[in-house]
């Protein structure tokens, strides 16, 4: 035996330790980001560590506290909002979560001019949504599903809508399905740029079937939670858009915005609203069969006191190979002429790129192009367009920020972030001040996240806003796993993967493999971001190799990959995970008798189908809150990718793609099924049906439910969940406790 000096004898190495599960559950290695709350071109607000609300002026370098932590504490405020005229601040307390984005709260208005809370005509409680007008200090709020307007915080409210009813009519806030699957917001009202008009959506859920589940609580009898929730093929909400003149709200009242005729001819959705000017608004509509989207630009007609949406200002976006858009249909970013706009949609080669639309979509000018995708348009100024893409070095899991000079011809492109901190930062987002005078860059990795402030004209870094020094120091004595992002080329498909390897990884050894999968349409798991999480612990402490694979159906690599799963969910996503596992085995360091797969939500569906694929590849696996049949999931999401569960549409694949149909195939794997009983999103029904099918097939399996927990399994349930899954995997991989 030849003894070689080992790094273990290094004094620094002796102090190094592996990650523990406790580290993960305690959030010991969580990072901070800094997003300025911009209030002008050169000023932003930020909540300091000691909870003061501080105003920073970049140009003078001065900062001062506009609201003390004492005032915040006096009403137990957890959030705030400054009125644009800087006279008032709303303070938000008694936060009570509802669904993913929605919550109710109590609001207090603080008068900055006299240092007192506004008394008289106080706001009712709890409020579902509240916001300032973009100019001045008008308030719009939603209470008990109705919208109210205050010209000033101390004024009596003007009631705009009167038909709001719990679970029936929603004004200014979305119902469950619009919140989760269409708007991705807690609000459905929009002020015009100068606060002259207020647009809002009304959702009528009267005819929607209701999902009902027990909430056990502490009482003698459980409560029943009822949510109007349209599952695939069911009756959908009926949406109408109204606009009211907030200066004279009683004059003509709310005016309905007409729906384009080609949309109104069958079931449809409203997808977003973008104000262009105070008297021009842009609405986006979508057919229920979500391959046709119409963007409609409407003008206020003072002579009609309502909104005119001429056919000449309707722009149609249609997909012939899949659904319209990516996850959502993109929204337009209007240019200064208030009629032309920039928008991301598929080019002729099937890559999502920025286009400039002046008159018709057919005559759109393509601004970006290549075998990569433009992902987000951050800001359009008179001379620049800022966007993010995954172009740089052809890594789809990166995000860099680019600037295109649109003021000059031909337009020139500059990557703002590509070479800033190249090793540390490859995945950015940005936040711009008014007129893009300044912007903050937030880098998410792959190194430790860092937030910086930049000059909008020169792109020069002005200062570091947050560099996570404490985290950096805390990680100095931690043996973090190694991460690599690479690709597999299989049958003309590129499968990008991220592999997380144990700290002392040795290619000549064999390691247990855990596949972590999500795999939902238009998702991306293989991203160059920093994370110290459960799988980091499994690699660091338990010596597992973890792999994440982006297969067909995933995003930002072109429509061929994205739309491959159209109308056949549950097929190629699973195939591609299996293909990748086979390739990993060929690499020589995977113990093929110890391979597991796990996923949550859509990932739970994919992991279940992979386990039941009959390949014999997987020893065990975990499904957390899985979908088990697409007939059980929300109409808006499901039908986007699957069409309708009707005989003349796609019922056959709805039936073929269930987990229950494969119950027999679970016989030779160890399966852990986990679900929260109060899951409003992927209903417990999904796991109940899997369990029933497995029992009926006399297949043994393990299960865990979390009483009164939703789709996120938060709080103490999180600790229990990850501890439980860790035990399961260690047992599966014959790892000692």
């Amino acid at each position: 035996i030849v003894l070689r000096p080992s790094r273990v004898h290094n004094s620094e190495e002796n102090t190094m330790r592996a990650l523990t599960l406790k580290d993960i559950l305690n959030g010991t290695f969580s990072y901070k980001t800094f997003f300025p709350n911009w209030i002008s071109g050169q000023e932003y607000l930020h909540q300091s560590a000691d909870n003061n609300i501080v105003l920073y002026n970049i140009e003078t370098g001065q900062s001062y506290t506009i609201l003390s932590n004492r005032t915040m504490k006096s009403v137990n405020a957890s959030n705030y909002g400054l009125s644009p005229d800087r006279q008032f601040v709303y303070l938000e307390s008694d936060y009570s979560k509802l669904w993913r984005y929605s919550y109710t709260a109590t609001y207090y208005i603080y008068d900055l001019s006299n240092g007192e809370f506004v008394r008289g005509n106080e706001l009712p409680r709890p409020i579902q949504y509240l916001c300032w007008s973009p100019v001045g200090s008008k308030l719009a709020y939603v209470y008990q599903n109705n919208i109210y307007l205050k010209q000033r915080p101390g004024d009596p409210p003007f009631q705009i809508t009167f038909n709001g009813r719990e679970n029936k009519i929603f004004n200014g806030i979305p119902d469950w399905v619009y919140e989760e699957e269409m708007l991705a917001t807690k609000y459905a009202l929009w002020w015009s740029p100068n606060g002259k008009f207020l647009a809002y959506a009304e959702f009528n859920d009267t005819d929607i079937p209701v999902i009902a589940y027990s909430y056990y609580g502490d009482e003698q009898y459980p409560r029943t939670i009822n949510i109007p929730y349209p599952k695939a093929g069911a009756k959908n909400p009926v949406v109408r858009i109204f606009i009211i003149d907030t200066t004279y709200p009683a004059y003509v009242g709310p005016q309905e915005v007409p729906v384009p005729a080609m949309i109104a001819s069958s079931d449809y959705y409203f997808s977003w609203l973008t104000w262009v000017t105070d008297e021009r608004v842009c609405l986006q509509w979508l057919k229920r069969v979500q391959n046709v989207s119409v963007l409609s630009i409407c003008d206020f007609r003072e002579d009609w006191q309502t909104w005119d949406c001429p056919k000449t200002q309707e722009h149609i976006e249609e997909s012939r190979t899949g659904w319209a858009g990516g996850f959502f249909v993109s929204t337009p970013v209007f240019s200064y002429d208030a009629i032309s706009y920039y928008k991301i949609f598929s080019d002729k080669d099937g890559y999502k790129h920025i286009h400039y639309i002046k008159d018709t979509v057919e005559n759109a000018i393509q601004i970006t192009s290549g075998k990569w995708e433009a992902i987000n348009i951050f800001r359009v100024t008179q001379d620049s367009l800022f966007y993010s893409s995954n172009e740089f070095e052809e890594y789809p899991g990166r995000r860099n920020i680019y600037r295109i000079s649109i003021g000059s011809y031909p337009p020139s492109k500059k990557c703002v972030t590509c070479h800033l901190r190249k090793e540390r930062c490859q995945y950015y987002t940005a936040s711009f001040s008014d007129y893009a005078k300044y912007y903050a860059l937030v880098c998410y990795g792959p190194g430790i996240p860092i937030s910086t402030l930049h000059d909008g004209r020169t792109d020069q870094e002005i200062k570091i806003l947050e560099e996570n020094k404490e985290l950096e120091n805390a990680l100095k004595n931690i043996q973090l796993p190694k991460e690599e992002i690479k690709k597999l080329e299989v049958d003309e498909i590129t499968l990008w993967y991220k592999m997380i390897l144990p700290p002392q990884f040795d290619r000549s050894k064999k390691y247990p493999l855990l596949i972590q999968v999500y795999g939902g349409p238009c998702s991306q798991s293989v991203r160059s971001v920093f994370a110290v999480n459960w799988i980091s612990y499994l690699a660091s402490k338990e010596g597992m190799v973890i792999a994440l694979v982006d297969g067909r159906g995933t995003a930002f690599q072109g429509d061929k990959l994205l739309y491959a799963v159209y109308r056949k969910l549950g097929v190629y996503e699973v195939e591609d995970q299996i293909t990748a596992v086979r390739k990993f085995i060929e690499m020589g360091f995977i113990d093929e008798k110890r391979i597991a797969i796990w996923g949550w939500s859509y990932g739970g569906y994919v992991s279940s189908l992979a386990l039941a694929s009959g390949t014999g590849l997987f020893k065990c696996g975990i499904a957390v809150a899985p979908v088990s049949s697409w007939e059980y999931y929300a109409s808006v999401y499901t039908e986007r990718f699957m069409g309708l569960p009707t005989k003349d549409d796609n019922l056959e694949h709805y039936k073929n793609s269930t987990v229950m149909a494969r119950a027999e195939y679970f016989r030779n794997v160890d399966y852990l099924l986990i679900h929260g009983t109060a899951d409003d999103n992927v209903h417990f029904q999904n796991s109940a049906q899997i369990a029933k099918a497995l029992v009926n097939a006399q297949v043994d399996f393990q299960a865990m439910w979390y009483s009164d927990q939703n789709h996120g399994l938060s709080g103490l349930s999180t600790n229990h969940l990850y501890t439980h899954m860790t035990h399961f995997l260690k047992q599966c991989f014959s790892l000692s406790d």
């Epitope: 004279y248 007409p258 729906v259 007609r301 003072e302 002579d303 009609w304 309502t306 005119d308 949406c309």
Partner: antibody, heavy 120, light 111 residues
Framework: QVQLVQSGAEVKKPGASVKVSCKAS????????IHWVRQAPGQGLEWMGW????????KYAQKLQGRVTMTTDTSTSTAYMELRSLRSDDTAVYYC?????????????WGQGTLVTVSS | EIVLTQSPGTLSLSPGERATLSCRAS??????????MHWYQQKPGQAPRLLIY???NLESGIPDRFSGSGSGTDFTLTISRLEPEDFAVYYC?????????FGQGTKLEIK
């Protein structure tokens, strides 16, 4: 009841200006658009433009742009229409008309008309 | 701009008869909600008087022998039984687009 009372007839020389007034009563002046319409002798009606006394919004017919100015005085509930650089073909009866509340472009009350004669 | 063409130019009828006046627009003046066409009556030396607004709505105070119909580009004003005071010039007007435009008028005269 709603009434629109216009100023009296005017005779002007070519190149001169004329300012016609229209005093409104019987309704809230700031809540309705005032249109101006003219009618040349023996001819049809021609829309000249509108003004909204409440918002200050003004729209002019393109062919008159640059020569016409519409104003209002909310304190006296009076609308004014001034036409400059008069030509002989501006000879017409000039009407002010109130924009109907529900008509969305219909004119429900009209002034009695003001005859403007442009002659050298 | 939208051009309105009225026909006939002159219509000669007797009291008690039915009058049908036509107005054709060079492009549609309708939306999904309304047809932005209005009808006026004008007698010599008087200001026009609103009869019908938004294609088919009778203005208050106007006798119900007057009615309006049509959508898109073709509109009709009908007077079911002519009274002596109905003989006048009739104008159609659109407010679908700016500039507002009027038809050239139809003169309804006693036969």
């Amino acid at each position: 009841q709603v009434q629109l009372v216009q100023s009296g007839a005017e005779v002007k020389k070519p190149g001169a200006s004329v300012k016609v007034s229209c005093k409104a009563s019987g309704y809230t002046f700031t809540e309705a658009i005032i249109h101006w319409v003219r009618q040349a002798p023996g001819q049809g009606l021609e829309w000249m433009g509108w003004i909204h006394p409440g918002s200050g919004s003004i729209k002019y017919a393109q062919k008159l742009q640059g020569r016409v100015t519409m104003t209002t005085d909310t304190s006296t509930s009076t609308a004014y229409m001034e036409l400059r650089s008069l030509r002989s073909d501006d000879t017409a009866v000039y009407y002010c008309a109130r924009h109907g509340g529900t008509g969305r472009g219909a004119m429900d009350y009209w002034g009695q008309g003001t005859l403007v004669t442009v002659s050298s | 701009e939208i051009v309105l063409t009225q026909s006939p130019g002159t219509l000669s009828l007797s009291p008690g008869e039915r009058a049908t006046l036509s107005c054709r627009a060079s492009q549609s003046v309708s939306t999904s909600a309304y047809s932005y066409m209005h009808w006026y009556q004008q007698k010599p030396g008087q200001a026009p008087r609103l009869l019908i607004y938004l294609a088919s709505n009778l203005e208050s105070g106007i006798p119900d022998r007057f009615s309006g119909s049509g959508s898109g580009t073709d509109f009709t004003l009908t007077i079911s039984r002519l009274e002596p005071e109905d003989f006048a010039v009739y104008y159609c007007q659109q407010s679908r687009e700016l500039p507002y435009t009027f038809g050239q008028g139809t003169k309804l005269e006693i036969k």
